[in-house]
């Protein structure tokens, strides 16, 4: 058993049929010695008396809020949560496996630049009685500070018969140098509590590996006189690290006909302009990627040819 | 047919093209190592991230773009760079910084070159003949060093008398390649920045 936060405790249980469970001793936080009784949740049934209560925790029915009273007055509470271990593996029932970039990916994180700011998100089908708390650090043995905000519900989607909820959190490394070469990864730890079930999820990464620039901005077409050709130009996104001559981007330019059957034409270029032969109903799209370290491509910025 | 081709125009910072070739060569070599040594811990997640130049060179600090010198977090470990004689003219200070930066890059390349050559000598003794260093990568390191045109004492190639542990050597190769790739990215950024300046 360990303390998650004040008056909230996590009991780690090997979860299999007829498991013996864990013996837990609760102590009432009071100077009083006599006349103390214990109850569980809203029940008035007295579970025991005395300053300590010994219980055998085997299942969710044994978890919950234990309260010690004296003469009708509440003295203190202890909330017991269960953390299940099945076949030596901690349960992952609360969050959905996003399977990207690999199986057992519950947390996904992205950074728009090298400032040390990043966003993580996760998915669940659970809509109520759900709380999250997020901690992060750079390295684990001698951790350096990363500050995370509160996790918030950021999107709701319907997936078949189910509703899916996306939660996200923003974190910022306390003292980040954009030009630094990372040798210790960022660690992100999410505590998830659904009713009386506790689970924890972790992710470890280097900022350089989770970079995904915003799409190029101000994508514009300028027709060239006496020609079917147009000059396409775009700019670095505002959120990208500066100076741009140091944190350079490369771009993918794509020309796509109206029908998906028409073959695309595409090139990669380090410039922020290109000349394109614009056919009726075609569209021009541009996306960005760090020029020197191949992490994710941005989403596309697109403009119609007409 | 392949005609001899002139080098990029001289207005271009001469090392930029070499540094781009370096990054390409290191990335290719790392990819090859990860494929060939698929049953070894050779991915970014599996290896220890070591920097053989730590405490010996200060490339990141010495080559920091001027725009980032206002960032306190970037100045933490800066002992040498930007601390110059107060009476120096701005242009002299800039050229001094650039010289410091480029000589630091040169020292990095020299250290990695020695490590890679030593390692290759060991790998050539492996009866499995599983992996060797790409000669193109070694040539590209050499080309960039020549383009940087610094003179410094030659570091003797480390030779060891004991029987090499090929498993350890291959893991060390992965560690070295990952670290060198990260340094090659920094070098490319620096060359791009200097070219634009």
């Amino acid at each position: 058993i360990w303390e998650l936060k004040k008056d909230v405790y996590v009991v780690e249980l090997d979860w299999y049929p007829d498991a013996p469970g864990e013996m837990v001793v609760l102590t009432c936080d009071t100077p009083e010695e006599d006349g103390i009784t214990w109850t569980l949740d809203q029940s008035s049934e007295v579970l025991g008396s005395g300053k300590t209560l010994t219980i055998q925790v085997k299942e969710f029915g044994d978890a919950g809020q234990y309260t010690c009273h004296k003469g009708g007055e509440v003295l203190s509470h202890s909330l017991l949560l269960l953390h299940k271990k099945e076949d030596g593996i901690w349960s992952t029932d609360i969050l959905k496996d996003q399977k990207e970039p690999k199986n057992k990916t519950f947390l996904r994180c992205e950074a728009k630049n090298y400032s040390g700011r990043f966003t993580c998100w996760w998915l669940t089908t659970i809509s109520t009685d759900l709380t999250f708390s997020v901690k992060s650090s750079r390295g684990s043995s001698d951790p350096q500070g990363v500050t995370c905000g509160a996790a918030t519900l950021s999107a709701e989607r319907v997936r078949g018969d189910n509703k899916e909820y996306e939660y996200s959190v923003e974190c910022q490394e306390d003292s980040a140098c954009p030009a630094a070469e990372e040798s210790l990864p960022i660690e992100v730890m999410v505590d998830a509590v659904h009713k009386l079930k506790y689970e924890n999820y972790t992710s470890s990464f280097f900022i350089r590996d989770i970079i995904k620039p915003d799409p190029p901005k101000n994508l514009q077409l300028k027709p060239l006189k006496n020609s079917r050709q147009v000059e396409v130009s775009w700019e670095y996104p505002d959120t990208w690290s500066t100076p741009h001559s140091y944190f350079s981007l490369t771009f993918c330019v794509q020309v796509q006909g109206k029908s998906k059957r028409e073959k695309k034409d595409r090139v990669f270029t380090d410039k922020t302009s290109a000349t394109v032969i614009c056919r009726k109903n075609a569209s021009i799209s541009v996306r960005a990627q760090d020029r020197y370290y191949s992490s994710s491509w941005s989403e596309w910025a697109s403009v119609p040819c007409s | 047919r392949n005609l001899p081709v002139a080098t990029p125009d001289p207005g271009m910072f001469p090392c930029l093209h070499h540094s781009q070739n370096l990054l390409r060569a290191v990335s290719n070599m790392l990819q090859k190592a990860r494929q060939t040594l698929e049953f070894y811990p050779c991915t970014s997640e599996e290896i220890d991230h070591e920097d053989i130049t730590k405490d010996k060179t200060s490339t990141v600090e010495a080559c920091l773009p001027l725009e980032l010198t206002k960032n306190e977090s970037c100045l933490n470990s800066r002992e040498t760079s930007f601390i110059t004689n107060g009476s120096c003219l701005a242009s002299r200070k800039t050229s001094f910084m650039m010289a410091l930066c480029l000589s630091s890059i040169y020292e990095d390349l020299k250290m990695y070159q020695v490590e890679f050559k030593t390692m290759n000598a060991k790998l050539l003794m492996d009866p499995k003949r599983q992996i060797f260093l790409d000669q193109n990568m070694l040539a590209v390191i050499d080309e960039l060093m020549q383009a940087l045109n610094f003179n410094s004492e030659t570091v003797p190639q480390k030779s060891s008398l004991e029987e090499p542990d090929f498993y350890k050597t291959k893991i060390k190769l992965c560690i070295l390649l990952h670290a060198f790739r990260i340094r090659a990215v920094t070098i490319d950024r620096v060359m791009s920045y200097l070219n634009a300046s």
Epitope: V255, D265, I277 | N2, V5, T7, H17
Partner: nanobody, 124 residues
Framework: EVQLVESGGGLVQAGGSLRLSCAAS???????MGWFRQAPGKEREFVAV????????DYGDSVKGRFTMSRDNAKKAVYLQMNSLKPEDTAVYYC??????????????????WGQGTQVTVSS
């Protein structure tokens, strides 16, 4: 190995036009193609580059708006239409096959195969 042969060069007055052609001995449809030029005593200079399907192009600053590159993959050929020619356009023009299928580059060493070149002279 692809052989390239340029043609269409010659002597032209300033303000005039020329159309250069580059014929390839094998398929060029899966690579970018470029035109470069070299004036006596000067570095080889990037002129234009074209994507595999010919819809995306890039031009050197000195020729933008005056030159137009195109390709015909079925004919295994690329072309360079040069209008409003200036004396400073005088050079040997080379066509080249890019080493990659889809990365634009202005750097000659990023191109694999080169033609022998065709001389363009613009008189004032």
């Amino acid at each position: 190995e692809v052989q390239l042969v340029e043609s269409g060069g010659g002597l032209v007055q300033a303000g005039g036009s020329l159309r250069l052609s580059c014929a390839a001995s094998g398929s060029i449809s899966s690579n970018i193609m470029g035109w470069f030029r070299q004036a006596p005593g000067k570095e080889r200079e990037f002129v234009a580059v074209i994507s595999r399907r010919g819809l995306i192009l890039d031009y050197g600053d000195s020729v933008k708006g005056r030159f137009t590159m195109s390709r015909d993959n079925a004919k295994k050929a690329v072309y360079l239409q040069m209008n409003s020619l200036k004396p400073e356009d005088t050079a040997v023009y080379y066509c080249a096959v890019g080493k990659t299928t889809d990365r634009f580059s202005e750097i000659p060493s990023d191109y694999d195969y080169w033609g022998q070149g065709t001389q363009v002279t613009v008189s004032s």
